[in-house]
Interface confidence: medium
């Protein structure tokens, strides 16, 4: 069965730093999402080989990719306190498959000692239920994204 290996399980970084999240699969997928979990889960990126990735508005200009969709490293730069959360990879295959999640703790530099990752991976209960709709990939454009400006600022 298809699996998604995700690392690290947890990382603590100061504000302004960067973090790498790696999602590895055995291949045979259409594309891969990175999602931020929580009360209101959000799609952060969608990556598919050969097309331009889509990236959430909050991370526009702060995301780099290396590797391929089968072994993808996502680098999030200039982290903010509000970026703290659990991020999970989702491989789009015949059956959607989730990684174990990465807990990213973004801290003020002076308070890092109070916020440390344990060695335990994020609890499975933190993972989302599979989306209700299908999630088949398609060609991408480079913009996109949630947490947009108020409607009055829209064109």
């Amino acid at each position: 069965a298809q699996e998604v290996q995700q690392s690290p399980h947890c990382t603590t970084v100061p504000v302004g730093a960067s973090v790498n999240i790696t999602c590895s699969t055995s291949g045979g997928l259409r594309g891969i999402y990175l999602r931020q979990l929580g009360p209101q889960p959000q799609d952060i990126i969608y990556y598919e080989d050969g097309v331009v990735p889509t990236t959430d508005r909050r991370f526009r200009g702060r995301i780099d990719f290396s590797g391929s969709q089968d072994n993808l490293t996502i680098t999030m730069h200039r982290l903010q306190l509000s970026d703290t959360g659990t991020y999970t990879c989702q491989a789009i295959t015949e059956v959607n498959v989730y990684g174990s999640g990465t807990l990213v703790l973004v801290t003020e530099e002076q308070s890092q000692g109070w916020h440390r990752c344990s060695d335990a991976p994020p609890r499975a209960s933190a993972l989302p239920a599979p989306p209700t709709g299908s999630a088949l990939p398609d060609p991408q454009t480079a913009s996109a994204l949630p947490d947009p400006p108020a409607a009055s600022a829209l064109p």
């Epitope: 889960p41 990939p137 991408q140 913009s143 996109a144 994204l145 947009p148």
Partner: nanobody
Framework: QVQLQESGGGLVQPGGSLRLSCAAS????????VGWFRQAPGKEREGVAC????????YYADSVKGRFTISRDNAKNTMYLQMNSLKPEDTAVYYC?????????????????WGQGTQVTVSS
């Protein structure tokens, strides 16, 4: 090529409800993030509600939060906008749109495919 066709608009009294539908042809909608936009006379087009291809992420304009609900039925290749507690200021032409990209975006220029629009009038 994607073709979109809205339906369900009409005249409704303040406080009433309408359900707009947008049927897609030419491709499957589940490959696209989709949204509803509206344009009132003399005003710019504004984003009302958007939903990602995965259905995980949604966006609602502040003016419609708690009153409007966007949804999609990929089996029927259709998306919907349920509008409750309608107000006169909701009067506008409502457009559905689809974008080549899987994540929600409320910027109208990021949507490549548009319906022709359906008129919604809220008046007593």
């Amino acid at each position: 090529q994607v073709q979109l066709q809205e339906s369900g608009g009409g005249l409704v009294q303040p406080g009433g409800s309408l359900r707009l539908s947008c049927a897609a042809s030419g491709t499957t909608l589940d490959d696209y993030a989709v949204g509803w936009f509206r344009q009132a006379p003399g005003k710019e087009r504004e984003g009302v509600a958007c939903i990602s291809a995965s259905e995980l992420s949604t966006y609602y304009a502040d003016s419609v939060k708690g009153r409007f609900t966007i949804s999609r039925d990929n089996a029927k290749n259709t998306m919907y906008l349920q509008m409750n507690s309608l107000k006169p200021e909701d009067t506008a032409v409502y457009y559905c749109a689809a974008r080549v990209g899987r994540i929600v975006d409320v910027t109208s220029t990021q949507y490549q495919y548009w319906g022709q629009g359906t008129q919604v009038t809220v008046s007593s």
